[in-house]
């Protein structure tokens, strides 16, 4: 019950090209203290899609406020879907780390479809 | 230890409305899913609906679409059931449940409240 | 929505001996994940419903070793190697692959 848990609520969700997609994570722990990234894919290919520390994501908009205090929400919106877009979403927190954070627990996934965009 | 404390047992009247209060203690409130589940005498468990309260938009199950609202108050650790045009089939035990540690919503409930009968009778 | 249809209806037990329900869905709950996501309840009387297998074979916090479950895609057993006094009431099993999650109609098991 105390050990911080990774919730991707949905373990899929369906978006038109063009649409943004919301992909959905909270925390229900603020410890360890570390950030948060998502990544498309699992494994050594995965693909970084957003980064809570650094990073330029112009597509990426978070669903509320990261810096704001005591945030367990960690949800993300990414703008113009198009097919490429399309796999598993992972959210996954990292624990401060020196001089690396280190990964700590990854949120269960979340499936992007991407239907054609209505004619 | 979680628990999860409901509010009293209520009579209403057909066409009412009755709302109920799930008060969670222990544990974080705000990340894991309140479902709100129902039992009419002699039958079976119903899935009506539920909401992970730090996000606030609730599912809701087809079958009560349009007459149940499920809300959840973060500041007092309180979810709540509302159910409206009440009918005398909606004579039924109503509980809370609670999502356990699993990575996606209504994956399992771990923690149940205590139930709340509402009766609907003129 | 999924239907979820438990078998039988009533389980007449004598302690000591074992027990077994079974579960059927409408469609698979093996995500490609490879969690079967079908869990466990049981209601004893006058009580709430308590959570026994969670992702179709995995113990809940505190629930005895005479519990187990199986079975995948479709078809799910939950078994009680000996069945004790306490053990009776009705049982449960609920899909959670899609919303809205979705029970059986029960299985009620009494001493014979």
């Known amino acids: 019950e105390d050990e911080l848990q990774v919730i991707q609520p949905e373990k899929s969700v369906s978006v038109a090209a063009g649409e943004s997609a919301t992909l959905r994570c909270a925390m229900t722990s603020l410890i360890p203290v570390g950030p948060i990234m998502w990544f498309r894919g699992a494994g050594a290919g995965r693909e970084l899609i957003y980064n809570q520390k650094e990073g330029h994501f112009p597509r990426v908009t978070t669903v509320s406020e990261l810096t704001k205090r005591n945030n367990l929400d960690f949800s993300i919106s990414i703008s113009n879907i198009t097919p490429a877009d399309a796999g598993t979403y992972y959210c996954v927190k990292f624990r401060k780390g020196s001089p690396d954070d280190v990964e700590f627990k990854s949120g269960a996934g979340t499936e992007l479809s991407v239907r054609a965009k209505p004619s | 230890q979680v628990q999860l404390v409901q509010s009293g047992a209520e009579v209403k009247k057909p066409g009412s409305s009755v709302k109920v209060s799930c008060k969670a203690s222990?544990?974080?409130?705000?990340?894991?899913?309140i479902s709100w589940v129902r039992q009419a005498p002699g039958q079976g468990l119903e899935w009506m609906g539920g909401?992970?309260?730090?996000?606030?938009?609730?599912n809701y199950a087809q079958k009560f679409q349009g007459r149940v609202t499920i809300t959840a108050d973060e500041s007092t650790s309180t979810a709540y059931m509302e159910l409206s045009s009440l009918r005398s089939e909606d004579t039924a035990v109503y509980y809370c449940?609670?999502?356990?540690?699993?990575?996606?919503?209504?994956?399992?409930?771990?923690?149940w409240g205590q139930g709340t009968l509402v009766t609907v009778s003129s | 929505d999924i239907v979820m249809t438990q078998s039988p209806l009533s389980l007449p037990v004598t302690p000591g001996e074992p027990a077994s329900i079974s579960c059927r869905s409408s469609?698979?709950?093996?995500?490609?994940?490879?969690?079967?996501?079908l869990d466990w309840y049981l209601q004893k009387p006058g009580q709430s419903p308590q959570l026994l297998i969670y992702?179709?074979?995995n113990r809940a916090s505190g629930v005895p070793d005479r519990f187990s479950g199986s079975g995948s895609g479709t078809d799910f057993t939950l078994k009680i190697s000996r069945v004790e006094a306490e053990d009776v009431g009705v049982y449960y099993c609920?899909?959670?692959?899609?919303?809205?999650?979705?029970f059986g109609g029960g299985t009620k098991v009494e001493i014979k």
């Open positions: 449940a609670r999502d356990g540690g699993g990575g996606y919503a209504y994956e399992y409930f771990q923690h």
């Open positions: 222990g544990g974080t409130f705000s990340s894991y899913a």
């Open positions: 909401i992970i309260p730090i996000f606030g938009t609730a």
């Open positions: 469609q698979s709950l093996l995500h490609s994940n490879g969690y079967n996501y």
């Open positions: 992702l179709g074979s």
């Open positions: 609920m899909q959670a692959i899609g919303v809205p999650p979705t």
